[in-house]
């Protein structure tokens, strides 16, 4: 740019030749003169932005080379400058290149391939191997600077391009550039740990892996112990992978080789990038020794009807994991171990459930069922009292020598025996008869067996032909036995018993 002096004001230097651009053939002499009484220096800015200085007011370059293409600026002591852009035209070197090409996503990237000859046509960008450039790629050519790729996308990463132009109808190409794209950070890192809680015994090894995912390797990550102020943990193993161009994954493995009780606490895996931070925590509890805690069972007394099924369910916490589980029936080891399963899918889970399924229970199968569980450090048990409810069964119904009618019934719960009389004309016996004697016989050794009840009435009270019913009943059901009377005169001719 040339000066336009105003009277009384300091004016910028004058350059000869007085033009904004100059074309010099390679091998010829480049001669520039700076005219200014207060001349200070010439500076030449190369195509790769380096500065060359010259304190003489005449810049003479014999046998000019293409690399001397660029901006020449003359400055004076008043700080005023004038510039001229020089093209050193070389038939063998149309483009000035040689620098890597970097770009940031969503920003512009300059392909540095300025021309040594402004009089070429179709200055443009092409894909290295003649393929099409991405359809959404737009560029702006500038002969003095290069070609600007507008609004760089991630998809352009490692795109190979050349600058191209036509001279006298012939296409000329620059050296190759591959664009290295730096992703714009548009989200916080993704941070995860497989388990959010850990329980260990003193001396055990604590290992937890934190996975950090981001678009760039520049993500920062670390393990912190919250106690309660965050403390950086240095002893961490790192592993990282590029799962793709913008899919970076790092694993930070925290290991405490011999955990102490005071290592218990909250550990945070923290990661941050230029967008923000993310974290995830995991809790460690270190216990002095292992344990087994059986959860209180709502009801250890279980009533079940004969022939039905029942599940005995025990929930417990155990660490280390249980080694032995067994069920004991009436103090005898049962072949049935029950079905043991973990309460949740969490790998560090310490909650277990054991379920013993008793199918089609018989009246004789009531009793104590004890679940025993143990690990290397502890043991625990819980006992269920199982009562099998059975419908009463009349065992005997007899006329005794002393004229008594006796009915013996068994069942659980304890049956009640009621007596009824009816004449032959009646459909059902409804007239109650009070028993003379009722006895409960505990014939079972076990308190869980059926209960036997004996009831008697005096047959002499009956004066008419008819039927006596002995009815045994409990919560489960009822059973009856019948005695038929026939009188001849004043004597009872016959007593027939039937059910």
């Amino acid at each position: 740019s040339q000066p336009s002096a105003s009277p009384g004001e300091p004016s910028p230097p004058s350059i000869h030749p007085a033009q904004s651009e100059l074309i010099v053939e390679a091998g010829d002499t480049l001669s520039l003169t700076c005219i200014d009484p207060d001349f200070v220096r010439w500076t030449f800015k190369t195509y790769f932005n380096e500065m060359v200085e010259n304190k003489k007011n005449e810049w003479i370059q014999e046998k000019a080379e293409a690399t001397r293409t660029g901006t020449y600026t003359c400055s004076n002591s008043n700080g005023l400058t004038s510039s001229i852009y020089v093209f050193v035209r070389d038939p063998a070197k149309l483009f000035l290149v040689g620098l890597p090409l970097f770009g940031k996503e969503d920003s512009d990237a300059l392909v540095r391939c300025p021309l040594t000859d402004p009089q070429v046509s179709n200055y443009s960008l092409i894909e290295c191997d003649g393929k099409s450039l991405p359809t959404d790629l737009t560029f702006v050519p500038n002969p003095k600077a290069g070609i600007t790729i507008k609004n760089v996308k991630r998809a352009y990463h490692r795109l190979c391009v050349r600058c191209a132009a036509q001279r006298d109808g012939t296409w000329l190409h620059s050296d190759k550039f591959t664009l290295k794209v730096r992703a714009a950070i548009k989200a916080i890192p993704v941070v995860s740990v497989p388990e959010t809680s850990h329980l260990l015994k003193k001396g055990d090894t604590f290992t937890v892996v934190c996975t950090i995912k981001d678009v760039s390797t520049s993500v920062n990550s670390m393990w912190l112990k919250m106690n309660p102020q965050p403390q950086h943990i240095a002893q961490v193993k790192h592993n990282s992978w590029h799962r793709g161009d913008f899919n970076y994954e790092r694993q930070e493995t925290l290991t405490i080789s011999s955990a102490r009780v005071d290592d218990s606490g909250v550990f945070m895996c923290y990661a941050n990038n230029t967008f923000g931070s993310a974290n995830v925590t995991t809790t460690l509890k270190v216990v002095e020794k292992g344990f087994i805690n059986i959860s209180p069972v709502k009801n250890t007394t279980v009533f079940v009807t004969d022939g039905e099924n029942v599940d005995l369910v025990v929930e417990y916490e155990a660490y280390p994991k249980p080694e032995h589980q067994q069920w004991i029936y009436m103090n005898r080891t049962s072949a049935n171990k029950g079905k043991d399963y973990v309460k949740s899918d969490n790998k560090s889970n310490i909650r277990y459930v054991n379920q013993l399924r008793l199918t089609r229970l018989k009246g004789t199968e009531g009793g104590t069922y004890t679940f025993l569980v143990s690990n290397s450090d502890a043991s625990a048990s819980v006992t269920f009292n199982v009562y099998v409810n059975t419908k009463p069964e009349i065992l005997t119904y007899d006329r005794l020598i002393n004229g008594m009618l006796q009915c013996v019934a068994e069942g659980f719960p304890e049956p009640t025996i009621d007596w009824y009389f009816c004449t032959g004309a009646e459909q059902r016996c409804t007239t109650p008869v009070s028993p003379v004697d009722v006895q409960v016989q505990n014939v079972s050794v076990s308190p869980f067996g059926k209960l036997v009840v004996q009831s008697s009435i005096d047959s002499s009270v009956f004066r008419h032909n008819g039927t006596v019913e002995c009815k045994a009943s409990n919560d489960v059901g009822k059973s009856s036995a019948f005695f038929n009377f026939a009188f001849k005169g004043n004597n009872k001719e016959q007593i027939q018993a039937h059910t």
Partner: antibody, heavy 118, light 111 residues
């Protein structure tokens, strides 16, 4: 002329620190991605770290992450490697290398030796 | 990380004879841009490594044309058409597709 010159190596005890420098000349340093590569005695080459031309992106091999820091001062045309908590297995000749347009190492320094020993 | 495996690890060659070194990667080094991110380096005794071949098959500036690189995906080969005494040293392949890894090296020596 175009060259890379490393310095700062030496003998150091385990757990101590050392800072390596790589002085670049003869090219526009601020336009190139730069790397550190090491070679343990009698062993092969191992990539250590990279820094982008403007210092924005960095990456490390897993064995040095958290202990080593790569940095650069473009005004001084110098690349650095700050090495903390040094271990015996960090003993090696450390080379700085320039990454070219094809992501290959087209220029290497002569190397500087780091010995970690008690 | 991508594992690079070279063979042979030692290669005695008579001057004037050809030589061939193989490099295999644990996953493909072919980028979607069509280039294989595989380079070959030579480290002469007592010297720093120097670039021979980049992007699988392109000779670096100043490298004699007796050196050539070929291959794609996971299998690559460096060939020296006629070995000269100055070619002695350790040859390394290197992948730059992901976090950079080198092969273990092949020592070329004159018989």
């Amino acid at each position: 002329q175009v060259q890379l010159v490393e310095s700062g190596g030496g003998v150091v005890q385990p757990g101590r620190s050392l800072r390596l420098s790589c002085a670049a000349s003869g090219f526009t340093f601020s336009r190139y991605g730069m790397h550190w590569v090491r070679q343990a005695p009698g062993k092969g080459l191992e990539w250590v770290a990279v820094i982008w031309y403007d210092g924005t992106n960095k990456d490390y091999t897993d064995s040095v992450r958290g202990r080593f820091t790569i940095s650069r001062d473009n005004s001084k045309n110098t690349l650095y490697l700050q090495m903390n908590s040094l271990r015996a297995e960090d003993t090696a000749v450390y080379y700085c290398a320039r990454e070219d347009w094809a992501e290959a190492f087209d220029m290497w320094g002569q190397g500087t030796t780091v010995t970690v020993s008690s | 990380d991508i594992v690079m495996t070279q063979s042979p690890l030692s290669l005695p060659v008579t001057p004037g004879e050809p030589a061939s070194i193989s490099c295999r990667s644990s996953q493909s080094l072919l980028h979607s841009n069509g280039y294989n991110y595989l380079d070959w380096y030579l480290q002469k005794p007592g010297q720093s490594p120097q670039l021979l071949i980049y992007l699988g098959s392109n000779r670096a500036s100043g490298v004699p044309d007796r050196f050539s690189g070929s291959g794609s995906g996971t299998d690559f080969t460096l060939k020296i058409s006629r070995v000269e005494a100055e070619d002695v040293g350790v040859y390394y392949c290197m992948q730059a597709l992901q976090t950079i890894t080198f092969g273990q090296g092949t020592r070329l020596e004159i018989k």
